[in-house]
C-alpha cells in the first residue's frame, strides 16, 4: 500500500544517479529511486536520484505530471536504470498539459 | 533528412518590427521544441526563444522578453519569431534549430540576418 | 544566469596536433553541456552532446569530458577541416554559451 508508514528500520535500494544533486557519485542510497524529466527554457533536463527519506519521495512521487515536469518513483535496487520520465501525451488525463511524443 | 529554412531578415530601422519564418522538414514537427538563436556580427552565440510542441509554453531570453514572441503553426510545419520595438543590438543572424528530447539543438538552419539600423 | 568561460579564446595548431579546449561553468551543471563547431558563414554544427556524447556522423577523433562546472573538447589529430571556432553551451538552466574559441592554422 502506498500510504502504508514506513517501517521502523526502511529497506533502503541502491539507485542510479544522475543530476546536479549527484556530485561524482554515479548511484546513491535511498528508500525509493526516481526518474524525473523538468524542462528549463525549453530544454529536457533529464535527472535520476533517491529519496533517502520515505517522506520527501511520498508527496514528489504523488504528483501528476505537468506540462513542465514529470516524475517516475520505484523502489528496489536500480529500479530506475531503465525509467525515463516523459511528460504527458495528448489522452492523457492531465488538464493542461501539452501533447509530446519521444522519437 | 532534417531541413530548417528561415526567412524574414532584412534591414529595418529602430522601432520597427520583423516576423521572422523557419520552415521545416524532414521530420514529424509537432512532435517537437523548435529554438531561435541568434549571433550578433563577429560574436558568439546566444539563445532567444523556444516553444513546446503545441505552442502552448514559451519561453525567452531577458534581452527579448516582452519585444519578441515566438509561436508555430504546426499544420504548416512553421515555426516564427515576431519582433517587435528592435534595437541596434538586435542586429544579427538568427537561426532556427530543433533539439530531440535528449539532444539539444541537434539541427539548425542557415540563418537569415536581421540589420537594425537607421 | 549561468555564465561559461571558455579557454583559450583562440589558439594556433598545426595538422595532426592534439587541441584541447576547457569551458568553465560559474556553477554545477552536471554534464548538461554541449558542443558546436562553426565555419565562417555557416550554421553550428553539433558534435558533443551530454558533455561526452558523440554526435551521429562526427568524426572519432573529437571527444568530450567533464561534469559539474569542468570540460574539456579534445581533437586527437587536427585535420584541416577542424579549423573552426568552437562552442560550448549549457542547458541546466538559462542555456548561455561559451564565448567561443578559434582554432587557426599555425
Known amino acids: 500500500m502506498e500510504d502504508e508508514k514506513p517501517k521502523v528500520n526502511p529497506k533502503l535500494y541502491m539507485c542510479v544517479c544522475e543530476g546536479l544533486s549527484c556530485g561524482n557519485e554515479d548511484h546513491c542510497e535511498g528508500q525509493q529511486c526516481f526518474s524525473s524529466l523538468s524542462i528549463n527554457d525549453g530544454f529536457h533536463v533529464y535527472q535520476k536520484g533517491c529519496f533517502q527519506v520515505y517522506e520527501q519521495g511520498k508527496m514528489t512521487c504523488k504528483t501528476p505530471p505537468s506540462p513542465g515536469q514529470a516524475v517516475e518513483c520505484c523502489q528496489g535496487d536500480w529500479c530506475n536504470r531503465n525509467i525515463t520520465a516523459q511528460l504527458p501525451t495528448k489522452g492523457k488525463s492531465f488538464p493542461g498539459t501539452q501533447n509530446f511524443h519521444l522519437e | 533528412e532534417v531541413q530548417l529554412v528561415e526567412s524574414g531578415g532584412g534591414l529595418v530601422q529602430p522601432g520597427g518590427s520583423l516576423r521572422l519564418s523557419c520552415a521545416a522538414s524532414g521530420f514529424t514537427f509537432s512532435n517537437y521544441y523548435m529554438y531561435w538563436i541568434r549571433q550578433a556580427p563577429g560574436k558568439g552565440l546566444e539563445w532567444v526563444s523556444s516553444i513546446n510542441t503545441d505552442g502552448g509554453s514559451t519561453y525567452y531570453a531577458d534581452s527579448v522578453k516582452g519585444r519578441f514572441t515566438i509561436s508555430r503553426d504546426n499544420s504548416k510545419n512553421t515555426v516564427y519569431l515576431q519582433m517587435n520595438s528592435l534595437r541596434a543590438e538586435d542586429t544579427a543572424v538568427y537561426y532556427c534549430?530543433?533539439?530531440?528530447?535528449?539532444?539539444?539543438?541537434?539541427?539548425w538552419g542557415q540563418g537569415t540576418l536581421v540589420t537594425v539600423s537607421s | 544566469d549561468i555564465q561559461m568561460t571558455q579557454s583559450p579564446s583562440s589558439l594556433s595548431a598545426s595538422v595532426g596536433d592534439r587541441v584541447t579546449i576547457t569551458c568553465k561553468a560559474s556553477q554545477n551543471i552536471y554534464k548538461y553541456l554541449n558542443w558546436f563547431q562553426q565555419k565562417p558563414g555557416k550554421a553550428p554544427k553539433l558534435l558533443i552532446y551530454?558533455?561526452?556524447s558523440l554526435q551521429t556522423g562526427i568524426p572519432s577523433r573529437f571527444s568530450g569530458s567533464g561534469s559539474g562546472t569542468d570540460f574539456t573538447l579534445t581533437i586527437s589529430s587536427l585535420q584541416p577541416e577542424d579549423f573552426a571556432t568552437y562552442y560550448c553551451f549549457q542547458y541546466s538552466s538559462g542555456p548561455t554559451f561559451g564565448q567561443g574559441t578559434k582554432v587557426e592554422i599555425k
Open positions: 534549430a530543433k533539439s530531440t528530447p535528449n539532444i539539444p539543438l541537434a539541427y
Open positions: 551530454y558533455s561526452n
